[in-house]
Interface confidence: medium
């Protein structure tokens, strides 16, 4: 097993001990990833986020959207399936939306779901070890030393199989020791979060990248993909790559985990698959994952600006949208030029790769990640990509 993957597994164990993020993924089938069957006609599967049908009470296991929320705790949260009450959320546009989940407190979710996450298996490779050091600059003390446990709200009623997420936070340590998960991956000024360039001085700016022939190391896709495909002797590409292998088709089942359809006029909007031609609403492909940035999650101050992304201490349930004493903002809001603004409104690209930003009461900014042909975006801010094809 190559050094990088071995190291990653060891580091992953440390992350669990440190209560760093991990994710349980339920029903992880190829179909769930929203990938089309080979041979289908070329189709753009899109859906306007603002027109997306909200899935509310009465959603059955075959039709429910899966949701994930980042919360503090040591167990999965498991919703009861049908009959869930909706969670009201604000979309980035300001529209209220209903999320198909009731978020339990961590202490209410304990019980049979307390088994520790499994270490992802690394595929054996005959190639050389890949670097285990991330090509990101050392991040200052504004990063949290801990990140809450990330869990999946499984509305399908099945037991989640835990896997480690690709997002996490960097422990404060020398740049050479940076571990192979990076919560801020999506902020890479040259990478997938290019739109986040409006974050002045954000991690991911290329100032302190190690220099190889005067260039950023080209294994930049590291950490973005959990397709543990080995790489060979070429040193310019990562062991886990979006490009390495194709999606394996599985036997077609009845379409499930569906959301309503809708045509997309503006293709830069939420890029969700709509129903297939000739298929009515409620029978489209599964399309998304929900990820919330937890109330406790510290994003830090944005240098050189008046925007604070760090939720202030206090009861996260307090209604602080308009600010108390002119200092605090409700979770998911940040102070900008004296008023509390939704991070969804303030940062249109807060959710990467076409994800839709929502605000969930007591939870904060919530990214609904989408899938498309060939790729599946996930992560707390949809910054990661999973695929074999």
């Amino acid at each position: 097993v190559p050094a990088r993957e071995t190291g990653s597994a060891i580091e992953a164990e440390e992350l669990v001990r440190s209560s760093l993020a991990w994710e349980s993924r339920a029903n992880d089938t190829r179909e769930e990833a929203g990938l089309p069957a080979a041979g289908e006609d070329e189709t753009s599967w899109t859906e306007r986020g603002s027109e997306m049908a909200a899935v509310g009470p009465g959603v059955g296991p075959e039709e429910a959207l899966e949701a994930s929320a980042a919360v503090t705790g040591t167990a999965w949260l498991e919703a009861d399936g049908p009959g869930l009450g909706g969670v009201t959320a604000e979309a980035g546009s300001g529209d209220a939306q209903t999320l198909p989940a009731t978020l339990q407190a961590p202490d209410e979710a304990l019980g049979s779901s307390t088994m520790p996450p499994a270490i992802p298996e690394a595929t054996e490779t005959s190639g050389p070890p890949s670097p285990a050091v991330h090509d990101k600059p050392s991040v200052g003390p504004e990063l949290p030393k801990e990140i809450p446990l990330e869990v999946r709200l499984n509305l399908g009623g099945s037991t989640p199989e835990p896997t480690f997420p690709l997002q996490g936070t960097l422990e404060t340590q020398p740049a050479s020791d940076i571990i192979d998960i990076d919560y801020f991956e999506g902020l890479d000024s040259e990478g997938r979060g290019a739109d986040m360039g409006s974050f002045p001085g954000s991690p991911g700016t290329s100032e302190n990248h190690p220099d190889t022939e005067g260039e950023t190391p080209s294994w930049s896709l590291l950490d973005l993909y959990d397709d543990f495909t080995p790489f060979d002797e070429s040193d310019f590409y990562p062991t886990t790559s979006f490009y390495d292998d194709l999606e394996e088709e599985e036997e077609e089942e009845e379409d499930k985990d569906t959301v309503g359809g809708g045509d997309l006029e503006d293709e830069n909007d939420l890029l969700l698959p709509s129903q297939k031609p000739g298929v009515g609403p409620g029978t489209g492909q599964p399309t998304n994952r929900w990820h919330a940035v937890p109330p406790q999650h510290t994003l830090g101050m944005v240098p050189g600006s008046s925007i604070s992304l760090r939720p202030r201490p206090g009861d996260p349930g307090k209604d602080l949208a308009s600010g108390e004493n002119g200092t605090e903002c409700r979770v998911g809001f940040v102070r900008h030029n004296g008023s509390c603004r939704s991070v969804c409104d303030l940062f249109p690209s807060y959710c990467h790769n076409g994800g839709q930003c929502y605000l969930v009461e007591n939870i904060g900014a919530f990214c609904r990640c989408n899938t498309q042909d060939y790729i599946w975006h996930k992560g707390m801010r949809c910054e990661s990509i999973i695929t074999d094809f």
Partner: antibody, heavy 116, light 111 residues
Amino acid sequence: EVQLLESGGGLVQPGGSLRLSCAASGFTFSSYAMSWVRQAPGKGLEWVSAISGSGGSTYYADSVKGRFTISRDNSKNTLYLQMNSLRAEDTAVYYCAKKWNLFDYWGQGTLVTVSS
Amino acid sequence: QSALTQPASVSGSPGQSITISCTGTSTDVNGYNYVSWYQQYAGKAPKLIIFDVSKRPSGVSNRFSGSKSGDTASLTISGLQAEDEADYHCSSYRRLRLPVLFGGGTKLTVL
């Protein structure tokens, strides 16, 4: 060193068939998707087909769908492209390439000429 | 399946910088940072020189750089050299069933 070596090209009449092969070495063949990309004389590149590492999934450009079949034999480290019902517009140099979207290694290409 | 749009040819003198554009749509270039550039000498196979918009494989000169703005990706070659004379192809991941789209290619002439 990664090497890809195509063979099987040649002159064929419209409606005819050809089978291209690509012998791969220098990497774990079964771990990677493989693709065929073609280039008509004086034209740009065109992605033709791709196959997953295990061979379980295959994808085709609309222009060849139903006529071309991509396959692989991982025990022989060989990629194939069976081309049937060939048309004049299929005339091109056919390259096999490692991976599917970003092609980090290419073969030298084999010329397929469809002409009567 | 329409190709990405590249100029048919560009030229420059040694030492100069040239930029080759590659224009697509929101379903490809603008939608994802999966733009690659390939260099192809006459009669030879293409060679990857830029991937993910701006990343260089090791061994590729840092005179080659990539960028993207909206629907258009660009390849810039600085300090032009005679050996840069070749065809340059861009490609992008595409959201539709066709997973990769190429440009028509640009012939670079070093005067």
